[in-house]
C-alpha cells in the first residue's frame, strides 16, 4: 500500500498504527512530540521499504532504537527535504541507536543527527555507502564517541562478522548496533545495489533486491517504478510522479490536492505529474491540465477575505509574497520595524495590480513606497469615502513615492488624497497625478501644499561634482561650493555612496526611517577658505567596483517661511581602479603519469578587475625524509576531552594536547587563542544552529485544530 | 505684502497667440501656493483659465485647454499665460491671482490687463 | 464641471440695512475633509475681486465682521449685516472642489 501525501504522528504513540500498511510512504514521516516514555516492542512495521520524502524524528521518549520499528526500510528518497536534510533525528532523549541496518540510499539529500544525549553507534556507519555525499552531513551534540564504547557484532569474540571501510583515515568495522552489520555490496557490483546473498541487482534496482539482475525484483526503484516494474524513464503516455513512479493522465486529473479541497487540480508539465505549473508557467486556462510559459512574472492572484489587507507588520506582508494580482484593498500602516523597507519589497514587490484601493497611514517607518516596486494598476473598483483609490495620510518620513522616470502607475478610477506628510514634497504629488492620469479628478482639498512638505528641501538647486579621481580603493571627488540665498544658511554637506554594480540606484534604495539604509554616509564640513571647492576621499573600497555617489547640502534656509530650500547632486557612477585579484582558490593537483602532473582552479573571490591570464610556477621539491621516520602504525594518545550531554553548546576538543617546554617544565600547555577565522566559524556554526532550529520548530509546531 | 503685476501687449490680432507676464513681489514664486490666471470679458463675470505650480504642474479649463499654456519662471520670480488662436471672443481684463492654502482661496490679484482682439 | 447659480442677479439695498445673496451649486461642495470649497469675492467698481470669505464660512483677513458666510452641501449664503455705502459692486461665489474652478454669474449689489 502507498500510504500519503506525508504522515504526521505525534502526542500519541498509538498513531503509529496509521503505518501498518504502508509499502512506500508517498511523502514525508513525521515522528514527533510524544513525551510519555511508551514500550515501542509491539510495533513492527516491517512492509515499509521506501520513504519518497525525508523521515523526521523529534522529541520522542521512550523509543530507543528505530530497528524494531522500521527493519526494512531501505531507501529515503529525498524527492523533498527538510532543510536541505532527508533524515533528521533531533532531541531523541532515549534513542540509543539508529539501528536502520536495512537503509542502503538515501537518494537526496543529507542527514542531520544532533541533540541525542544519549545516541550512539554513529562513528560506525559508513555513510558514504548510503548518500552520494557526505560532506553535508550533520552529527553533532550526541553521546560521546569514548563513552559509547560501541562494538560491532563479533568483536568481543574476535569473530568479527562485519566489513570494514575507512572513514577519515580511520579503517574499522562498520555497524548499526551491537547485533546488525551495515550491509555492504561486493565491489564487482559497483554502484549497483545486491541481494543479501552478495548478488548484484539488475541496475535499475535502488537499495536491494530479491533476485539478482531482475528489474521485478527490486526493493526500490532508481529511477522510476511502473507496473511492477523498476524503468529508466516513464513509457509513451505516462507521467513522472512523486519523483519515483510513473502514472496514467487519468490518475494525475483525480488527484485531490492534499493543500487544498478547492485547488485547480494537478497539471502535466514537461512529462510530470504535478501539483503546480512549475516557476516561470502557468495553466492553460483555469481547466486546464497543462502550462505554457508566463509573460515577465507569473501571474498569482491573492484574494482577502475581509476585503481589506492590512499591512502592519512584516509578519502580514509575508501573505503577500509570490503575488501579483491582489484583488481587495491594501491598507498599509508600518509605524515601526527592522530593514523594513527590503523586507516589505521582498514580501510585495511582485504585486503589479491592486483592484481595490491603497491607503497609506501612520506608516512613520516608510521613506518611500518603492518597496511595491512592480505596482503598474490600481483598478479602484472599490474606493473609500469620497471616492478615493490611493490614499495617503499622516506619514512622518515618507519622501518619495516612486522614481517616476522609471514607473508607470495607472489609476483608473477614483481620486487621490494626501495630507500631513511633512516630508513629502507636493511636487511629487503632482508628478504622480500626471503619470497616474488622475490629473483633475484632484480638487484643492485633496492635495495641500501646506501640510504636504512642509518639513523638507522641496526646493533643490543642483550640486555640479567638479572633479573625481579614483584609485584601487579610493575615489576622491569635489563640487561646486553651494551658495544659499543667505550664505549662513549652509551648514555642511552629506555624502552618500554604495557599490552599484548597475546604473539603476535611486535615493531611497533599502531606506526606511528606523535607520535602515543601504548608503553610506559622511558628512563633510564646509572648507574655512571661501574659495575652495568641498570634496571628500572616501577609502576603504573594493578595487575594480562601481560605486553610486551623490550629495546633499545640509541648509536652514526657508523660501517665504514656508518650505525648506535645499541643495543636492545626480547620482554620479564612478569605478575603482583594478588591483591585483585575491589568490585563485581550491588549488588541486594530481599526477596522472610518472611525467605529468594535472592541476586545476577555480576563479579567485576577489578579481579586482578583468582577469586575463594565469601564471602557473612549479619547482621540484626534494623529497622529505620524515615521511620514512614516522610510524604509522602507532596509535596517536588518546585525545583529552569534554563531554556532550546532548547540547552542543559545550565545546568538543578532538585535537590532541600540545606538549611543549612551558614555564622550564614539560607538560600540557594552555591552548592557544583561536584565531579570527576560528571564531568567526565558531559564530557562523552557532548561527547555522539557531536558524535550523527556527526552521524545525516553525514547521512542526502548529495550532491545534478547532 | 505680496503684489503681481501683469504685462503684456493690449491688442492681440485674430489667430494669433496671447502672452502675458505676472511678476510676483513681496514673495517667492517657490511658495507653496497655486499660480492663477482669470479672465473677464466687459461687462461679463468671471473665467478660471488655469494655474500653475513653481514645481511646473499645471491644470488647465478643459473649455480652453488646447489653446492654453502657462508656465513659470523661478528664477525671475515669473509666471506667463500663452493663448493661442486668439479670436474676438477672447477680449477680456486678464488677471493673475494666487491661490493661496493658508486662506485656502485667491487672496492676491492683480490690477488685471486689458488685452483686445482686433485687426 | 460644477455649475454655480447665483440670485438675484441684482440687489439694491439701503445703507444700514441688512442684505443677503444666495449661492447654489450642482453638486455638494463638502470634501471628505469636513471642509466646504466655497469662496465669496466682492469687485468694487474698477477694481479687481477681494476675497471675503473662503471655507464657505471663514472671514478673509482684514474684511470687516459685518459679512458672513453660511450653508453647506449645496445651497450659500452671503449676509451683510449693514450694508454701508462702501460694500457696492459685484459679488461672486466660486467653488474649489473640482477642476475646473467655476464662479457664479455674479450679484450686483447697489445702493437704492
Known amino acids: 500500500e502507498i500510504c500519503g501525501p506525508g504522515i504526521d504522528i505525534r502526542n500519541d504513540y498509538q498513531q503509529l498504527k496509521r503505518l501498518e500498511n504502508c509499502t512506500v510512504i508517498e511523502g514525508y514521516l513525521h515522528i514527533l512530540l510524544i513525551s510519555k516514555a511508551e514500550d515501542y516492542r509491539s510495533y513492527r512495521f516491517p512492509k515499509l521499504t521506501v520513504i519518497t520524502e525525508y523521515l523526521l524524528l523529534f522529541r520522542v521518549a521512550g523509543l530507543e532504537s528505530l530497528g524494531d520499528l522500521f527493519p526494512n526500510l531501505t531507501v529515503i528518497r529525498g524527492w523533498k527535504l527538510f532543510y536541505n536534510y532527508a533524515l533528521v533525528i533531533f532531541e531523541m532523549t532515549n534513542l540509543k541507536d539508529i539501528g536502520l541496518y536495512n537503509l542502503r540510499n538515501i537518494t537526496r539529500g543529507a542527514i542531520r543527527i544532533e541533540k541525542n544525549a544519549d545516541l550512539c553507534y554513529l562513528s560506525t556507519v559508513d555513510w558514504s555507502l548510503i548518500l552520494d555525499a557526505v560532506s553535508n552531513n550533520y552529527i553533532v551534540g550526541n553521546k560521546p564517541p569514548k563513552e559509547c564504547g560501541d562494538l560491532c557484532p563479533g568483536t568481543m569474540e574476535e569473530k568479527p562478522m562485519c566489513e570494514k571501510t575507512t572513514i577519515n583515515n580511520e579503517y574499522n568495522y562498520r555497524c548499526w548496533t551491537t547485533n546488525r552489520c551495515q550491509k555492504m555490496c561486493p565491489s564487482t557490483c559497483g554502484k549497483r545495489a545486491c541481494t543479501e546473498n552478495n548478488e548484484c541487482c539488475h541496475p535499475e534496482c535502488l537499495g536491494s533486491c530479491s533476485a539478482p539482475d531482475n528489474d521485478t525484483a527490486c526493493v526500490a526503484c532508481r529511477h522510476y517504478y511502473y507496473a511492477g516494474v523498476c524503468v529508466p524513464a516513464c513509457p509513451p503516455n505516462t507521467y513522472r510522479f512523486e519523483g519515483w513512479r510513473c502514472v496514467d493522465r487519468d490518475f494525475c486529473a483525480n488527484i485531490l490536492s492534499a493543500e487544498s479541497s478547492d485547488s485547480e487540480g494537478f497539471v502535466i508539465h514537461d512529462g510530470e505529474c504535478m501539483q503546480e505549473c512549475p516557476s516561470g508557467f502557468i495553466r492553460n486556462g483555469s481547466q486546464s491540465m497543462y502550462c505554457i510559459p508566463c509573460e515577465g512574472p507569473c501571474p498569482k492572484v491573492c484574494e482577502e477575505e475581509k476585503k481589506t489587507k492590512t499591512i502592519d507588520s512584516v509578519t502580514s506582508a509575508q501573505m503577500l509574497q509570490g503575488c501579483t494580482i491582489f484583488k481587495g484593498n491594501l491598507l498599509i500602516n508600518i509605524r515601526r520595524g527592522n530593514n523594513i523597507a527590503s523586507e516589505l519589497e521582498n514580501f510585495m514587490g511582485l504585486i503589479e495590480v491592486v483592484t481595490g484601493y491603497v491607503k497609506i497611514r501612520h506608516s512613520h517607518a516608510l521613506v518611500s513606497l518603492s518597496f511595491l516596486k512592480n505596482l503598474r494598476l490600481i483598478l479602484g473598483e472599490e474606493q473609500l469615502e469620497g471616492n478615493y483609490s490611493f490614499y495617503v495620510l499622516d506619514n512622518q518620513n515618507l519622501q518619495q513615492l516612486w522614481d517616476w522616470d522609471h514607473r508607470n502607475l495607472t489609476i483608473k478610477a477614483g481620486k487621490m488624497y494626501f495630507a500631513f506628510n511633512p516630508k513629502l514634497c507636493v511636487s511629487e504629488i503632482y508628478r504622480m497625478e500626471e503619470v497616474t492620469g488622475t490629473k483633475g479628478r484632484q480638487s484643492k482639498g485633496d492635495i495641500n501644499t501646506r501640510n504636504n512638505g512642509e518639513r523638507a528641501s522641496c526646493e533643490s538647486d543642483v550640486l555640479h561634482f567638479t572633479s573625481t579621481t579614483t584609485s584601487k580603493n579610493r575615489i576622491i571627488i569635489t563640487w561646486h561650493r553651494y551658495r544659499p540665498p543667505d550664505y549662513r544658511d549652509l551648514i555642511s554637506f552629506t555624502v552618500y555612496y554604495k557599490e552599484a554594480p548597475f546604473k539603476n540606484v535611486t535615493e531611497y534604495d533599502g531606506q526606511d526611517a528606523c535607520g535602515s539604509n543601504s548608503w553610506n554616509m559622511v558628512d563633510v564640513d564646509l572648507p574655512p577658505n571661501k574659495d575652495v571647492e568641498p570634496g571628500i576621499l572616501l577609502h576603504g573600497l573594493k578595487p575594480w567596483t562601481q560605486y553610486a555617489v551623490y550629495v546633499k547640502a545640509v541648509t536652514l534656509t526657508m523660501v517665504e517661511n514656508d518650505h525648506i530650500r535645499g541643495a543636492k547632486s545626480e547620482i554620479l557612477y564612478i569605478r575603482t581602479n583594478a588591483s591585483v585579484p585575491s589568490i585563485p582558490l581550491d588549488v588541486l593537483s594530481a599526477s596522472n603519469s610518472s611525467s605529468q602532473l594535472i592541476v586545476k582552479w577555480n576563479p579567485p573571490s576577489l578579481p579586482n578587475g578583468n582577469l586575463s591570464y594565469y601564471i602557473v610556477r612549479w619547482q621540484r621539491q626534494p623529497q622529505d625524509g620524515y615521511l620514512y621516520r614516522h610510524n604509522y602504525c602507532s596509535k596517536d594518545k588518546i585525545p583529552i576531552r569534554k563531554y556532550a550531554d546532548g547540547t552542543i553548546d559545550i565545546e568538543e576538543v578532538t585535537e590532541n594536547p600540545k606538549t611543549e617546554v612551558c614555564g622550564g617544565e614539560k607538560g600540557p600547555c594552555c591552548a592557544c587563542p583561536k584565531t579570527e577565522a576560528e571564531k568567526q566559524a565558531e559564530k557562523e556554526e552557532a548561527e547555522y544552529r539557531k536558524v535550523f532550529e527556527n526552521f524545525l520548530h516553525n514547521s512542526i509546531f502548529v495550532p491545534r485544530p478547532e | 505684502q505680496v503684489q503681481l503685476q501683469e504685462s503684456g501687449p493690449g491688442l492681440v490680432k485674430p489667430s494669433g497667440t496671447l502672452s502675458l507676464t505676472c511678476a510676483v513681489s513681496g514673495g517667492s514664486i517657490s511658495s507653496s501656493n497655486w499660480w492663477s490666471w482669470v479672465r473677464q470679458p466687459p461687462g461679463k463675470g468671471l473665467e478660471w483659465i488655469g494655474e500653475?505650480?513653481?514645481?511646473?504642474?499645471?491644470n488647465y479649463n478643459p473649455s480652453l485647454k488646447s489653446r492654453v499654456t502657462i508656465s513659470v519662471d523661478k528664477s525671475k520670480n515669473q509666471f506667463s499665460l500663452k493663448l493661442s488662436s486668439v479670436t474676438a471672443a477672447d477680449t477680456a481684463v486678464y488677471y493673475c491671482?494666487?491661490?493661496?492654502?493658508?486662506?485656502?482661496?485667491?487672496?492676491?490679484w492683480g490690477q488685471g490687463t486689458l488685452v483686445t482682439v482686433s485687426s | 464641471d460644477v455649475v454655480m447659480t447665483q440670485s438675484p442677479l441684482s440687489l439694491p439695498v439701503t445703507p444700514g440695512e441688512p442684505a443677503s445673496i444666495s449661492c447654489r451649486s450642482s453638486?455638494?461642495?463638502?470634501?471628505?475633509?469636513?471642509?466646504?470649497?466655497l469662496d465669496w469675492y466682492l469687485q468694487k467698481p474698477g477694481q479687481s475681486p477681494q476675497l471675503l470669505i473662503y471655507l464657505g464660512s471663514n472671514r478673509a483677513s482684514g474684511v470687516p465682521d459685518r459679512f458672513s458666510g453660511s450653508g453647506s452641501g449645496t445651497d450659500f449664503t452671503l449676509k451683510i449685516s449693514r450694508v454701508e455705502p462702501e460694500d457696492v459692486g459685484v459679488y461672486y461665489c466660486m467653488q474649489a472642489l473640482e477642476m475646473p474652478l467655476t464662479f457664479g454669474g455674479g450679484t450686483k449689489v447697489e445702493i437704492k
Open positions: 453638486q455638494s461642495l463638502l470634501h471628505s475633509n469636513g471642509y466646504t470649497y
Open positions: 491671482a494666487r491661490y493661496s492654502y493658508g486662506t485656502v482661496g485667491i487672496d492676491y
Open positions: 500653475i505650480y513653481h514645481s511646473g504642474s499645471t
